[in-house]
């Protein structure tokens, strides 16, 4: 019973988890235009990882996307890469999860296949939520970086003979949305992974029998018998994925200004 | 598009009047109301903004004593309300609908409000 | 408060000149989020309001006649009238819309000889 509620859980956890990722992947709220400085403009931007958006005071607002793919920071294509990987993991362990359920019989499929399907599915999430929470954090860190570097130049002059005022952009609440789903993801790809262990068959060890030879007596008492699981001394598909394989190699220098318009 | 404001006012200095500006022919909830005061032979100054849906409120620093923007969206008008009045006060107030670029798209015909003993 | 001043003060032409007017900000009203320059033309006649002549320093309010162009960017902005006629006697204002309070400029008036 507790293995099925774990099981579920997982399985609810992970889903709001995958939804969130979905929604902040697509949300235009990347980073906002910090304000704390500079309350007094009648134009809010923000960005998301598709397009940026212009909110004028008087309602409109005009959102364009960033219709080239070779001009864009390498950062943000690194970004976008990992959100739809975890988004794409995450709907792949959603599949397989649903068919592990223990609360749903398909056929005649052992505990052990289920066993199995839980614990790929239960690892396709953490590594989802992993990608999503990396993605979430590479933007966020690029944010950080370009704040500051705006900041020390806030007001730079054509020659120094302009002020024009620099946008400076903070958090936007996509990230929030995104590091919360990812933890989510994450939790419910534990709680996956707990839940195949109960699943797996228990070790069934047989009480001795005597056997009564004519003659003499003679018991005979066999080891405990071990089912093959993969978790026992039979490993013969233990490693069943092997998440983490993650290169770094995209990520280069990226331009000062969080402007891809 | 039109934007109809009350006519002109003769008031006392010291005391209060309240300017209106109906609107027709377009969403009244869907845009800005802004406010603008001209002086006799002067320039344009911005007064400030309401936002019929919400009710919420931008004010030019200058007018936030003086004025007080409302609006009612059953009846589709604005209303703005000067206190204390003193002859500076003396002026046409003209209501605009905010269009793109944050400009004032429609104007009202405006309302000559004169301060005098 | 961001100061608009406009040049000349006045101007008189005759119909069917050019005429240029300046409008010149104390800050850039350029955008970095979407590159358009906050900035506003109105024309007002005797004895009426404003009418809106451009937005975004150079898009044409629909209806304005294709001899009103606004351009410029960053703090310095132009409004052209490529042939004046009777009817463009009027001050003329440009009002930045990107900093609030939003402020005007003081008129350049056009009359015509």
């Known amino acids: 019973m507790a293995v099925t509620a774990c099981q579920g859980l997982g399985f609810v956890v992970s889903l709001i988890g995958i939804a969130g990722i979905i929604a902040a992947t697509c949300m235009d709220q990347w980073s906002t235009q910090d304000l704390y400085n500079n309350p007094v403009t009648a134009v809010f931007n923000y960005q998301g990882l598709w397009r940026s958006c212009v909110r004028e005071s008087s309602g409109f607002t005009e959102c364009r996307g960033y219709f080239t793919l070779l001009g864009l920071p390498a950062m943000l294509q690194a970004v976008r890469a990992l959100m739809i990987v975890g988004i794409v993991l995450g709907a792949i362990g959603l599949l397989v999860s649903i068919f592990a359920l223990k609360c749903i019989r398909i056929g005649s499929m052992e505990d052990s296949a289920k066993a199995n399907m839980t614990l790929t599915s239960g690892i396709m999430f953490i590594v989802s939520g992993l990608c999503a929470i990396a993605g979430v954090s590479v933007f966020a860190n690029m944010l950080v970086t370009n704040f500051w570097m705006s900041t020390a130049n806030m007001y730079t002059g054509m020659g120094g003979m302009v002020q024009t005022v620099q946008t400076r952009y903070t958090f936007g609440a996509a990230l929030f949305v995104g590091w919360v789903a990812g933890g989510l993801t994450l939790i419910g790809g534990v709680m996956m992974c707990i839940a195949c262990r109960g699943l797996a068959p228990e070790e069934t060890n047989y009480k001795a029998v005597s056997y009564h030879a004519s003659g003499h007596s003679v018991a005979y008492k066999p080891g405990g018998f071990k089912a093959s699981t993969g978790f026992g001394s039979n490993t013969k598909n233990k490693k069943i994925y092997d998440g983490g394989a993650r290169t770094e190699d995209e990520v280069q220098s990226y331009p000062s200004k969080h402007d891809y318009v | 598009v039109q934007l109809q404001e009350s006519g002109a006012e003769l008031v006392r200095p010291g005391t209060s009047v309240k300017v209106s500006c109906k609107a027709s022919r377009y969403a009244f909830t869907n845009y800005l109301i802004e406010w603008v005061k001209q002086r006799p032979g002067q320039g344009l100054e911005w007064i400030g903004m309401i936002n019929p849906g919400s009710g919420g409120t931008h004010y030019n620093e200058k007018f936030k004593v003086k004025a007080t923007l409302t609006a009612d969206k059953s009846s589709s008008t604005a209303y703005m309300q000067l206190n204390s009045l003193t002859s500076d006060d003396s002026a046409v107030y003209f209501c605009?609908?905010?269009?793109?670029?944050?400009?004032?798209?429609?104007w009202g015909q405006g309302t000559l409000v004169t301060v005098s003993a | 408060d961001i100061m608009m001043t406009q040049t000349p003060l006045s101007l008189t032409v005759t119909a069917g000149e050019k005429v240029t007017m300046s409008c010149k900000s104390s800050?850039?009203?350029?955008?970095?989020?979407?590159?358009?320059?906050?900035l506003t033309w109105y024309q007002q006649k005797p004895g009426q309001p404003p009418k809106l002549l451009t937005y975004w320093a150079s898009t044409r309010e629909s209806g304005v006649p294709a001899r009103f162009t606004g351009s410029g960017s960053g703090t310095d902005f132009t409004l052209t009238i490529s042939s004046v006629q009777a009817e463009d006697l009027a001050v003329y204002y440009c009002q930045n819309g990107y900093f609030y309070p939003y402020t005007f400029g003081g008129g350049t008036k056009l009359e015509i000889k």
């Open positions: 605009a609908r905010g269009g793109f670029g944050n400009s004032f798209a429609y």
């Open positions: 800050q850039s009203l350029l955008n970095g989020g979407n590159l358009k320059n906050y």
